[in-house]
């Protein structure tokens, strides 16, 4: 959706929410992908009847994309060439580089619960390493 704003930073974070928070966010967890390839970041909010007004996707403290219930998708200008909306409320990262390694957050803005935050750790591997089956893992 063609929002009329420049690129800007969002604020990451983990947790928070209303006193009656019952929901949980399931994510793809710790994942790895090959340099130059693509990866889908997925979160799913369950176990709550809260209304989802907006989902923000953030990397560290940078806003990547927004999916708004009224307006649909907006991709931040500095990421528009490498980020695609979907599938669903997920986000597809393309043309991956080693610099894309790091934490990603899906932030669900809901009513009346408040904010739910899911975390995904992505490691982008050099092609030769990926071909040999190496995978990033956090114990």
């Amino acid at each position: 959706y063609p929002y009329d704003v420049p690129d800007y930073a969002g604020g990451g974070g983990s947790g928070g929410g209303g006193s009656m928070m019952t929901g949980t966010i399931e994510t793809t967890g710790n994942i790895s992908a090959e340099k130059g390839g693509s990866i889908i970041l997925q979160c799913h909010l369950s176990s709550t009847t809260a209304q989802v007004a907006q989902v923000n996707w953030e990397q560290q403290d940078q806003l990547l994309a927004i999916c708004n219930a009224d307006l649909g998708w907006h991709i931040s200008p500095s990421f528009k060439d490498r980020v695609a909306p979907g599938p669903g409320l997920g986000l597809t990262l393309q043309s991956l580089t080693v610099n894309d390694t790091g934490e990603y957050f899906c932030i669900y803005h809901t009513y009346p619960d408040g904010t739910y935050t899911g975390r995904i750790f992505l490691e982008v591997l050099e092609s030769s390493v990926a071909e040999h089956g190496a995978r990033f893992q956090i114990p």
């Epitope: 959706y1 929002y3 009329d4 704003v5 800007y8 969002g10 604020g11 990451g12 974070g13 983990s14 947790g15 928070g16 929410g17 209303g18 006193s19 209304q51 007004a53 907006q54 923000n56 403290d61 806003l63 927004i66 708004n68 219930a69 009224d70 307006l71 907006h74 803005h109 009513y111 009346p112 619960d113 408040g114 904010t115 935050t117």
Partner: antibody, heavy 119, light 107 residues
Framework: EVQLVESGGGLVQPGGSLRLSCAAS????????MHWVRQAPGKGLEWVAF????????YYADTVKGRFTISRDNAKNSLYLQMNSLRAEDTAVYYC????????????WGQGTMVTVSS | DIQMTQSPSSLSASVGDRVTITCRAS??????LAWYQQKPGKAPKLLIY???TLQSGVPSRFSGSGSGTDFTLTISSLQPEDFATYYC?????????FGGGTKVEIK
């Protein structure tokens, strides 16, 4: 330049009604959620109501729920607050404010309109 | 509802002073806290959101820190135009709630 201009305030008797308006300019109004926030004389700020860009999400403070109605007309770049069954404790300056696109705070505010509820 | 408690309620300071205002939430709000400045007869102005992110156009002498329940607004070198009332506000859940305000006066 983003501008928000409130109007419609005034003196009203307890139990009466008033409709506040907020005229928006300088941005694409239909892309942004909007709030009403009030401030009683000499007091702090109190959030009143929120409406999302396309009106699918509407939230109220418990103190006004059932008495106040927030609405918007994107074609007219206008936000409204219909206030019924007014009480003395509703006396305040009422501000309209724009929600940041990322839903993280209110980034632009109008100058406010004064509502006085008194007999 | 989440209660937001600001301290001090007022303070006196001189131009050039470093000023610190604190805000405490009655329960964790992660990083979702905003700070506003309000001058008499004027509308509030957003300074900081998400705990530490400076709103565009706000001078870098303003900074925010904290997460969970305890937050701080710091003005590194107070300027004449900074004498005002400052409010914190949690934007983690509805109803959004504000602190009672801190009035920064000239010493």
């Amino acid at each position: 330049e983003v501008q928000l201009v409130e109007s419609g305030g005034g003196l009203v008797q307890p139990g009466g009604s008033l409709r506040l308006s907020c005229a928006a300019s300088g941005f694409t109004f239909s892309n942004f959620g909007m709030h009403w926030v009030r401030q009683a004389p000499g007091k702090g700020l109190e959030w009143v109501a929120f409406i999302s860009s396309g009106s699918s999400s509407i939230y109220y403070a418990d103190t006004v729920k059932g008495r106040f109605t927030i609405s918007r007309d994107n074609a007219k770049n206008s936000l409204y607050l219909q206030m019924n069954s007014l009480r003395a404790e509703d006396t305040a300056v009422y501000y309209c404010a724009r929600m940041r696109l990322d839903y993280y705070a209110m980034d632009y505010w109008g100058q406010g309109t004064m509502v006085t509820v008194s007999s | 509802d989440i209660q937001m408690t600001q301290s001090p309620s007022s303070l006196s300071a001189s131009v050039g002073d470093r000023v610190t205002i604190t805000c405490r939430a009655s329960k964790s709000i992660s990083k979702y806290l905003a700070w506003y400045q309000q001058k008499p007869g004027k509308a509030p102005k957003l300074l900081i959101y998400s705990g530490s992110t400076l709103q565009s156009g706000v001078p870098s002498r303003f900074s925010g820190s904290g997460s969970g329940t305890d937050f701080t607004l710091t003005i590194s070198s107070l300027q004449p135009e900074d004498f005002a009332t400052y409010y914190c506000q949690q934007h983690n859940e509805y109803p959004w709630t504000f602190g009672g305000g801190t009035k920064v006066e000239i010493k």
